[in-house]
Each structure stands twice: as structure tokens, then as C-alpha cells.
């Protein structure tokens, strides 16, 4: 390493760290899809940002290698809960690699949040934060899942949101 | 950018990457002051600190522009519950901005926690966390606010906080 | 500082911040011991890393004194809950110091999720999630505690984990 | 103020029905739990039960669950106490009063009580 | 079920003395720092008045000479100076569990 070379690296770094790798996303009303797939976002509006990370189809795409703590929460909610559906509720974050054909289980989160109302009738709010920090390849792909999607409330971007920073 | 003027950058970047703005509030007796105002919090004592941001009647003051990772844990508690406001709890963090004079809604939890007690005991317990990366300018200032704070159960500075670190 | 002692601190500053300290710990079938220790954690296999910091019987051990944010979260379940189990589980990050006998409490929350069993199964799930900012010298440790650690449900590492990074 | 009305003393014969009336005044109905007590005479006091007056859901001392209904008419903020199957053992006056959660859940006003009286 | 035990079961206090009730839980009343245990005072013909909330709070328009302490599983209700108006009976009452149970009482007599 040359003092021009170790120079150049500095520079680089310097112009790297003005844009550490950083994305808040947050809910739409386009969010939920009831296809199967995962959670969509706002990248722009509001409070919404991209900045070292891009986005495809509700994944945060990763341009940089490194690790990142990812985090996501999502406001749950429902009078009731629908018959049938399992007492458990699973929040994830899940990563999709080129190397890999399935999605990867990152962090998970199981809450039975419908007993919380103390009769069929009762309205009942919840909410599951996820957090923590993962290694991530450059074009390596973070997605939100929600099973089962239909209790997920969204309104104005505050309540369920998604988001990364390189650490 | 001459070799001289990065030179600058670069031990000004260094210098300012030492104080790294960071901040870890604690829940205290003062806290909750049932005024209708976002939470107080102590700033120096035990587990608290301000490392390059500052602290005005329950608001961290940002001095250096950036994206934050802000966060907020509460703990909430009762003995049953009381009837009226407060069968969802609002947990959020909030933004005072010099160009807006109201209040904006950045992170956001609704919970109903009191349908939790067991059978026959009417204790319940829950707790309920925030985070995420926001853009604040120099001057604007993040709070903290429970509704219904009386379900905000302080003891030592662990189990409430309020806290924020730009990334 | 003269420019050769500047641009020395600069090297060393790059190779540091090449590696920021970071971990994440994920649970595994021997995290839970059952002897009133803290929960023990996997450091090597699939998610789990360590990164400028070290481990030891379940404690995160400090190399490099600063501020880090540390995490914590843990899959609560059960059916039912086990006779003459406080309604209250409490879940912590707590920090042992050579210069202090005994753990000091950093971050902690107290949950009653036994109540959340839907009357038509006795099954329920719940998650706690913990994360601050902490200051933390040389040879600190930080641990992770939950009573009563048989409603733990450990399955694949993506359910219980425990993390920090320097801010 | 804070008032809690009851109904007048009963005399049933054994094997009917009752029902106890509580009109409150003077707060927000809907923002206090009712509870019911009994209290036999020459006894002590027997905490029957409690309904939420926001959707009318009850919650009963074990002991009472076979023998009472409780429900409200948010409407004219009455609370009632439905008593069935009526056995010398029900003799007693009940009273309804307002739970405050700020006071810890204590009853902190009372209706005059209602007398029951079980007598062939 | 939390038994709430009274003791003594009547006492005769001399005007302006002190009367001390006790009442015993079977198991802690406590939560964050307050004891659920709360106190009534019940005259002949009337509905019990509540006097203490939460071990040591007094309701508004009680005298100040009637004061409550306490934690735990142990409490105790002190009435000093006793006046006339306070003979009675005296009930205490656990919140924090169902059943919401209440002592045996204690009649209270001025001598």
C-alpha cells in the first residue's frame, strides 16, 4: 500500500462513508398484496428514503456488501380475528441470494395477539418490531412477510415500515 | 478538491467521527407529568448520556444534520385497566420541526395490552418498542409520547428509554 | 499533530473502521441451561458472527471501550403456563464489570403473554424485543436473562438471537 | 356528583327471578367498571362481579357465575343484576358500585343498597 | 382465592385514642410499588364508605386523623384521635386478584 494508493483509498472511503448504506421504507396502502408474496413500500414519499440500497418489488436490494442491522415492525389489528385462522401470526424478514432458490429465514417473530380481546367482539392492537444485524452480498435481497397479512393495519407510513443501515 | 482541502475534510471527518451524535435517555420519577406533554427524561444520571445532541424538556435536539436511528422502549403495566381512553395504548415518536407547527408522527405503536391478565390475577405487563432511521435537520427535536401515560410503569431507567444514534 | 502522525492515525482509523465491532448471536438447542445462568448463545454457525468482539459462556466480551447498541430478542410460547408462574416474564441485557460484583441491569422488559391463549387454544406466542445504546468499556460483558426461561421457545436461530455494534 | 341509584327492596318466594336496577349520574358511565357486592345480614361483603359498561362484557366471581347476569343500557347509564333460581341463601342486600382504576380499583361510590328478601 | 384476614374482630377505643386495625393477605397485594388493599367504613343501615385506596391513600372528604400503611401481605388502618362519629364497622379489600375479597371486619366501639 503506497502512501498515492492509501491516499485514494481514503478519499474513496470518505466519499463512501457521506453515503453509509441506509433505507427507511414504509407502509402504503399498496402494502399488502393478498397475492403470497411478500410486503410492498413506499421508497419515496414522506418519510420514506433510499440512499445506498435500492428497491424491487418490496425488497431492499443490497448494492454494497457489508453487515447491516435490517429491522422491520408491523402494526397488527383486527375486531376479532377471522375464523380459521391459526392463533399464531409470523412477522419475518427473509433473504433472497442469487445463490440460493428459496428465501432465507433472517429474523421471525410468532405473536398470538387475537387473545388480547377479551371477547369475539373487542377490538385488539398489537405490534412486532424485528432487529438485528446480518451479513449481506451485494444484489442479496431483504423482503417483510406477514402470514397472515389480512391483520396487518396499515394507515400513514408510521405504524409498519422497513428499513436497513450498514453498520 | 485539491490534495490540501480533502486533507482538511479528512481530519475533519476523523475529529467528527469520534463524536459519532448519540444518546441513551432513561425513564425517571419526573417522567411522566400527566400534563398532556411527551415524556421527560433523565440526561446524565446512571445509564443516560448525550454525546453530540441535546436534550430540552423531553426533546432530543439534533445539532448535526443527518439520518438517526431513534428508538423508544416503554414499559407499560396495570392492574386491570381503565375504561375509556384507554383500551389501545399509542407509543410514539414524534417530530418538532421550526418549519411546521405541528407535531409529525415518525414511528407509531398501537397496543392493547390490557386483555393480557391471566384468569384470576389482574396484573398485566407489556412492553412496547420503536425504532428507525429518520432525516433530521440541525434544530429539530424528537419526543416521546404514551396515551394513556398512566399505564407507564418507571422504575430504574431500564425498562423505559428513549434514545437516538446517526448511522 | 504534525502530518505524518495525522495520516498515521488515518491509516489506523480506515483499518478500525474496517472493522467496526458487530455480532449477532443466534439461539440454539443448548441455550437454555436450566442452572439460573444467562442464556447461552451460537457464535459461528449459519446467521451468527463475531466481529471485533468477543464471547464467552453466553457474555458478549468487549475488546474496544464505546458506545454500542446492543439487542436482544427472545420467542416466547407455551400452552398454557406453568402453575405458580408469575403472570410476569421478565427478559434483559445485563452488564458484568471486573470493577462491580454483581450485574447491572442495562435493558429490560416484563411481559404477561399467558393471557394471550384464544379461548378455543391454550397455545399462545409472544416476542420481546430489547435494544439501547450502552456504554461500554474493555472486558465488559453483557449477557442476556430471561425468567422464567422454560417459556423460551428456541427453534432455528431466526427466533432468539442477541446482537451489539459500535454507534 | 357522582350518584348511584338502586331499585326498591324485593320479597320473592324461592325458585323466581329478580331484577336489580343501578341508575349512575354525575360521570361518565362508560368510563367505569360496575361492580356488584353482596352482603348478607349481620355479614360481611361478597364481591359478585363486574361489567365493563363500554360493551357490556361481565366478569363473575366463580361462586356467582350460575346465579347472576349482569348487564347495562348505556343509554339511560343504568347497570343491572339479573338474579335467578332464588334460594334463602340469595336473602341479602346487594349493592352496585363504581370501580375507579385510578384509586387502585377500589369501589369508591355505592348505591344505597337493594334488599332481597327470599321468603315463601 | 386471596383470604384476607381481620384482626381483632372488635375493639373499644377511648375517645381521642388511637385505633390500629390490622388485616392480613394470604398472599402479596403488591404491584410496582403500591399495595392493593383498600379500606371501608360501613355505619348501620348505610353502604360501606371507602376511606383508603391503594395501602395509604385517603379518598377525598376523609378526615386526615384516619391514615393507612403497609405492603406486602401486612396492612394496617390507624384512626387517631378517635371520635364518636367513627364507631363503625371496618372492612379491608385486596384489588389485585379475583376474586376481589374482603375482610370479616372490625367493629370498632368508642368507649
Known amino acids: 500500500d503506497g502512501p498515492a494508493g492509501s491516499w485514494e483509498q481514503l478519499i474513496q472511503e470518505r466519499r463512501s462513508h457521506e453515503v453509509n448504506p441506509a433505507a427507511h421504507l414504509t407502509g402504503a396502502n399498496s402494502s399488502l398484496t393478498g397475492s403470497g408474496g411478500p410486503l410492498l413500500w413506499e421508497t419515496q414519499l414522506g418519510l420514506a428514503f433510499l440512499r445506498g440500497l435500492s428497491y424491487h418489488d418490496g425488497a431492499l436490494v443490497v448494492t454494497k456488501a457489508g453487515y447491516y442491522y435490517i429491522y422491520s415492525k408491523v402494526q397488527l389489528g383486527g375486531v376479532g380475528c377471522p375464523l380459521g385462522l391459526a392463533s399464531t401470526i409470523t412477522h419475518g424478514l427473509y433473504k433472497r441470494t442469487p445463490r440460493y432458490p428459496e428465501e432465507l429465514e433472517l429474523l421471525v417473530s410468532q405473536q398470538s395477539p387475537c387473545g388480547r380481546a377479551t371477547s369475539s367482539s373487542r377490538v385488539w392492537w398489537d405490534s412486532s418490531f424485528l432487529g438485528g444485524v446480518v451479513h449481506l452480498e451485494a444484489g442479496e435481497e431483504v423482503v417483510v412477510r406477514v402470514l397472515d397479512e389480512r391483520l396487518v393495519r396499515l394507515r400513514d407510513g408510521t405504524r409498519s415500515y422497513f428499513g436497513a443501515f450498514m453498520v | 478538491d485539491g490534495p490540501a482541502g480533502s486533507w482538511e475534510q479528512l481530519i475533519q471527518e476523523r475529529r467528527s467521527h469520534e463524536v459519532n451524535p448519540a444518546a441513551h435517555l432513561t425513564g425517571a420519577n419526573s417522567s411522566l407529568t400527566g400534563s398532556g406533554g411527551p415524556l421527560l427524561w433523565e440526561t446524565q444520571l446512571g445509564l443516560a448520556f448525550l454525546r453530540g445532541l441535546s436534550y430540552h424538556d423531553g426533546a432530543l435536539v439534533v445539532t448535526k444534520a443527518g439520518y438517526y436511528y431513534i428508538y423508544s422502549k416503554v414499559q407499560l403495566g396495570g392492574v386491570g385497566c381503565p375504561l375509556g381512553l384507554a383500551s389501545t395504548i399509542t407509543h410514539g415518536l414524534y417530530k418538532r420541526t421550526p418549519r411546521y407547527p405541528e407535531e409529525l408522527e415518525l414511528l407509531v405503536s398501537q397496543q392493547s395490552p390490557c386483555g393480557r391478565a391471566t384468569s384470576s390475577s389482574r396484573v398485566w405487563w407489556d412492553s412496547s418498542f420503536l425504532g428507525g432511521v429518520v432525516h433530521l435537520e440541525a434544530g429539530e427535536e424528537v419526543v416521546v409520547r404514551v396515551l394513556d401515560e398512566r399505564l407507564v410503569r418507571l422504575r430504574d431507567g431500564t425498562r423505559s428509554y428513549f434514545g437516538a444514534f446517526m448511522v | 499533530d504534525g502530518p505524518a502522525g495525522s495520516w498515521e492515525q488515518l491509516i489506523q482509523e480506515r483499518r478500525s473502521h474496517e472493522v467496526n465491532p458487530a455480532a449477532h448471536l443466534t439461539g440454539a438447542n443448548s441455550s437454555l441451561t436450566g442452572s439460573g445462568g444467562p442464556l447461552l448463545w451460537e457464535t459461528q454457525l449459519g446467521l451468527a458472527f463475531l466481529r471485533g468482539l468477543s464471547y464467552h459462556d453466553g457474555a458478549l466480551v468487549v475488546t474496544k471501550a464505546g458506545y454500542y447498541y446492543i439487542y436482544s430478542k427472545v420467542q416466547l410460547g407455551g400452552v398454557g403456563c406453568p402453575l405458580g408462574l408469575a403472570s410476569t416474564i421478565t427478559h434483559g441485557l445485563y452488564k458484568r464489570t471486573p470493577r462491580y460484583p454483581e450485574e447491572l441491569e442495562l435493558l429490560v422488559s416484563q411481559q404477561s403473554p399467558c393471557g394471550r391463549a384464544t379461548s378455543s387454544s391454550r397455545v399462545w406466542w409472544d416476542s420481546s424485543f430489547l435494544g439501547g445504546v450502552v456504554h461500554l468499556e474493555a472486558g465488559e460483558e453483557v449477557v442476556v436473562r430471561v425468567l422464567d426461561e422454560r417459556l423460551v421457545r428456541l427453534r432455528d436461530g431466526t427466533r432468539s438471537y442477541f446482537g451489539a455494534f459500535m454507534v | 356528583q357522582v350518584q348511584l341509584k338502586q331499585s326498591g327492596a324485593e320479597l320473592v318466594k324461592p325458585g323466581a327471578s329478580v331484577r336489580l336496577s343501578c341508575k349512575t349520574s354525575g360521570y361518565t358511565f362508560t368510563n367505569y367498571y360496575v361492580y356488584w357486592v353482596k352482603q348478607r345480614p349481620g355479614q360481611g361483603l361478597e364481591w359478585i362481579g363486574e361489567?365493563?359498561?363500554?360493551?357490556?362484557?361481565?366478569n363473575f366471581n366463580e361462586k356467582f357465575k350460575s346465579k347472576a347476569t349482569l348487564t347495562v343500557d348505556k343509554s339511560s347509564s343504568t347497570a343491572y343484576m339479573h338474579l335467578s333460581s332464588l334460594t334463602s341463601e340469595d336473602s341479602a342486600v346487594y349493592y352496585c358500585?363504581?370501580?375507579?382504576?385510578?384509586?387502585?380499583?377500589?369501589?369508591?361510590?355505592w348505591g344505597q343498597g337493594t334488599s332481597v328478601t327470599v321468603s315463601s | 382465592d386471596i383470604v384476607m384476614t381481620q384482626s381483632p374482630a372488635s375493639l373499644a377505643v377511648s375517645l381521642g385514642q388511637r385505633a390500629t386495625i390490622s388485616c392480613k393477605a394470604s398472599?402479596?397485594?403488591?404491584?410496582?410499588?403500591?399495595?392493593?388493599m383498600n379500606w371501608y367504613q360501613q355505619k348501620p343501615g348505610q353502604p360501606p364508605k371507602l376511606l383508603i385506596y391503594k395501602a395509604s391513600h385517603l379518598d377525598s372528604g376523609i378526615p386526615a386523623r384516619f391514615s393507612g400503611s403497609g405492603s406486602g401481605t401486612d396492612f394496617t388502618l390507624n384512626i387517631h384521635p378517635v371520635e364518636e362519629e367513627d364507631a363503625a364497622t371496618y372492612y379491608c379489600q385486596q384489588s389485585i386478584e379475583d376474586p376481589l375479597t374482603f375482610g370479616d371486619g372490625t367493629r370498632l366501639e368508642i368507649k
Open positions: 358500585t363504581r370501580s375507579n382504576w385510578d384509586y387502585g380499583n377500589a369501589m369508591d361510590f
Open positions: 398472599q402479596s397485594v403488591d404491584f410496582d410499588g403500591d399495595g392493593y
Open positions: 361489567i365493563n359498561p363500554t360493551n357490556g362484557d361481565p
